[in-house]
């Protein structure tokens, strides 16, 4: 069936020291080996987690413990299919100052992404 | 039940070589990283480095970068560590611990580890 | 090489409240995970993520976080809590992991 990176593309906006997780929905393959990406560079494999849903099936997190304004940018997973790259579609990390009010943003058309998720 | 069952105690000279291993059961070895982590005697833990049994990703603290090798072997769901010549410097408890993460009902994540019972290498002329 | 710094002993009479403290320049961006380790035994991860509870770790264990300085809380130990506690976080450039070099919980 190949590959399948479920969800929408997002623009998230955070409140500055808050933390995040973004999330990236693989299908199609076994065992993945999700990379993350930011502004066109690797972000360290030691910063994400994956979760095995079913054997064609997985999640891989990426945690921010603290968003800072270096954070801010855009961010997608991608993963090694047949040799070939595929790429999800991004998501935009804006930030805004600490204490104001963050509003997240989805933008609904055909994405590779799921929606991140927040935690405190 | 998750199960990670180590190789025995040895005891080895200087300049010999070494390769201890963790054999996991109870989960899919490749779905998960696993970490090697040293604890010299009466003293506290280092990590070592970690593997990833699918793709076999390797990242190792700067200590011992070029001192030992992590490697695994899918078929038998078994990870390694490996010195090709061993210093007195070496005498530790070697544990190997194995990193996963869950969701219950929701989507974010659980973490959780499982460790070794640990090999006690011992380096001695 | 990136390191993390905590006190070498910690001593409370049973039913006080410990505090063990871990500090770390990455801290402010680096969760930090505690273990628990008893005399002769295998670590257990007691906190993860700054203060999540590990699975089967009772509530008296609880950790935060502010700044550069993580901190793991025993409120009301017990004698049985009487072991060596790691921190344990990701190095500032995110591609190698620190243990900090323990505390010796004394509960007489």
């Known amino acids: 069936a190949g590959l399948k990176l479920m969800g929408a593309p997002v623009k998230l906006t955070v409140s500055q020291g808050q933390p995040v997780k973004l999330n990236c929905s693989v299908e199609g393959m076994e065992e993945p080996d999700i990379q993350w990406v930011k502004d066109g560079a690797v972000v360290q494999n030691l910063d994400q987690l994956y979760i095995p849903v079913s054997e064609q099936h997985w999640i891989g997190f990426l945690s921010l413990k603290s968003v800072e304004r270096s954070d801010a940018g855009r961010y997608w997973c991608q993963v090694e299919d047949g040799g070939e790259t595929e790429i999800s579609q991004p998501v935009w990390l804006t930030l805004v100052p600490r204490g104001s009010s963050a509003h997240h943003h989805h933008h609904h058309h055909h994405s590779a992404w799921s929606h991140p998720q927040f935690e405190k | 039940e998750v199960q990670l069952v180590q190789s025995g105690a040895d005891v080895k000279k200087p300049g010999a070589s070494l390769t201890i291993s963790c054999q996991a059961s109870?989960?899919?070895?490749?779905?998960?990283?696993i970490s090697w982590v040293r604890q010299k005697p009466g003293k506290g833990l280092e990590w070592m480095g970690q593997i990833r049994g699918q793709h076999s990703s390797t990242l190792y603290g700067p200590s011992f970068q070029g001192h030992v090798t992590i490697s695994a072997d899918r078929s038998t769901a078994t990870a390694y560590l490996q010195w090709r010549s061993l210093e007195a410097s070496d005498t530790a408890m070697y544990y190997c611990?194995?990193?996963?993460?869950?969701?219950?009902?929701?989507?974010?994540?659980?973490?959780?580890?499982?460790w070794g019972p640990g090999t006690l290498v011992t380096v001695s002329s | 090489s990136y390191e993390l710094t905590q006190p070498p002993s910690v001593s409370v009479s049973p039913g006080q409240t410990a505090r063990i403290t871990c500090s770390g320049d990455?801290?402010?961006?680096?969760?930090a995970y505690w273990y628990q380790q008893k005399s002769g035994q295998a670590p257990v991860l007691v906190i993860y993520?700054?203060?999540k509870r590990s699975s089967g770790i009772p509530e008296r264990f609880s950790g935060s976080s502010s700044g550069t300085m993580a901190t793991l809380t025993i409120s009301g130990a017990q004698v049985e809590d009487e072991a060596d506690y790691y921190c344990y976080s990701l190095s500032d450039s995110g591609n190698y992991f620190v243990f900090g070099g323990g505390t010796k919980l004394t509960v007489l």
């Open positions: 109870g989960y899919t070895f490749t779905d998960y990283w």
């Open positions: 993520e700054d203060a």
């Open positions: 611990v194995r990193h996963g993460a869950s969701t219950s009902g929701g989507t974010i994540p659980e973490y959780y580890q499982h």
């Open positions: 990455a801290l402010p961006k680096k969760y």
